[in-house]
């Protein structure tokens, strides 16, 4: 799939920070999403998980950004990249994990999908 360029990753990180900064209230009314393995292919997996959250304006930009990182079209209920579906977590926790890992990848220059 397409490799997210450094600038695109920076923009994703910045948006994830925007969503979470100083945030204590549950995101998306406390909606739960499938946890994902933070490995290669995580952007598609993240999108497949988050796309099932509807009516949450806070994460719409993140959903659009992730769709640009994923080589195939993703629709709600699709789980081709979501290898493990055994744990659901709050959207806020999911975003925080995604942010932490994306920053880790960025720091190490591994901007793979």
């Amino acid at each position: 799939g397409p490799v997210p360029p450094s600038t695109a990753l920076r923009e994703l990180i910045e948006e994830l920070v925007n969503i979470t900064q100083n945030q204590k209230a549950p995101l998306c009314n406390g909606s739960m999403v499938w946890s994902i393995n933070l490995t290669a292919g995580m952007y598609c997996a993240a999108l497949e998980s988050l796309i099932n959250v509807s009516g949450c304006s806070a994460i719409e930009k993140t959903q659009r950004m992730l769709s640009g990182f994923c080589p195939h079209k993703v629709s709600a209920g699709q789980f081709s990249s979501l290898h493990v579906r055994d744990t659901k977590i709050e959207v806020a926790h999911f975003i925080t994990k995604l942010l932490s890992y994306t920053k880790q990848l960025f720091r190490h220059g591994q901007q793979f999908n």
Partner: antibody
């Protein structure tokens, strides 16, 4: 030792400019979100603005009274934060503090850690 | 612009419990932070993220939050706690910081 040391304050005429510096040591400055806070004589604390770490986008935000006149920047290679103040007004007279930004502590490596400089005095008077 | 409102002053006798409040419309979703400032000194963080206490801060300092109000509680206030206390938070975007007007705590010795 974890510390911040401000410099560059002084007396300046209305309409003039001044650049404040804040030298950081003892922590990973590049990971830190940094703020400028000021305190006018006998008044309360006023948030001036903040700059995120570069990895978090390097976004800079300003308080309404200084937007368009003040510019915050950072040089991670020198562990230094700057505040460029232009078009100064008498109401900008204050002690200026640099500090780690607690909102950014969650993203940096200084969770719950609190670092402030000793402050540098800026006096705007004709 | 967004504002945080604090009472200008609070007075207690030594050993009593002091409560300082901070109200703001965004506080249900944004964390509050509390700073202590003694005369001529830089502020010191005493509570972060509503309820957490930094290392080195005495256990008598605690924080809570409910709805649009955050509260700093000093259980068994001591003379050395006499200072100005400021709440700090952000607007709903999280992008702009704001301090409350400050509360002067007097511990009547």
């Amino acid at each position: 030792e974890v510390q911040l040391v401000e410099s560059g304050g002084g007396l300046v005429k209305p309409g003039g400019s001044l650049r404040l510096s804040c030298a950081a040591s003892g922590f990973t400055f590049s990971n830190a979100w940094m703020s400028w806070v000021r305190q006018a004589p006998g008044k309360g604390l006023e948030w001036v603005g903040r700059i995120r770490s570069k990895i978090d986008g390097g976004t800079i935000n300003y308080a309404a009274p200084v937007k368009g006149r003040f510019t915050i920047s950072r040089d991670d290679s020198k562990n230094t934060l700057y505040l460029q103040m232009n078009s100064l007004k008498t109401e900008d007279t204050a002690v200026y503090y640099c500090a780690t930004d607690q909102v950014g502590a969650y993203y940096g490596d200084y969770y719950g850690m609190d670092v402030w400089g000793q402050g540098t005095t800026v006096t705007v008077s004709s | 612009s967004y504002e945080l409102t604090q009472p200008p002053s609070v007075s207690v006798s030594p050993g009593q419990t002091a409560r300082i409040t901070c109200s703001g419309d965004a506080l249900p979703e944004k964390y509050a932070y509390w700073y202590q400032q003694k005369s001529g000194q830089a502020p010191v963080l005493v509570i972060y993220e509503d309820t957490k206490r930094p290392s080195g801060i005495p256990e008598r300092f605690s924080g809570s939050s409910s709805g649009t109000m955050a509260t700093l509680t000093i259980s068994g206030a001591q003379v050395e706690d006499e200072a100005d206390y400021y709440c700090y938070s952000t607007d709903s975007s999280g992008n702009h910081g704001v301090f409350g007007g400050g509360t002067k705590l007097t511990v009547l010795g």
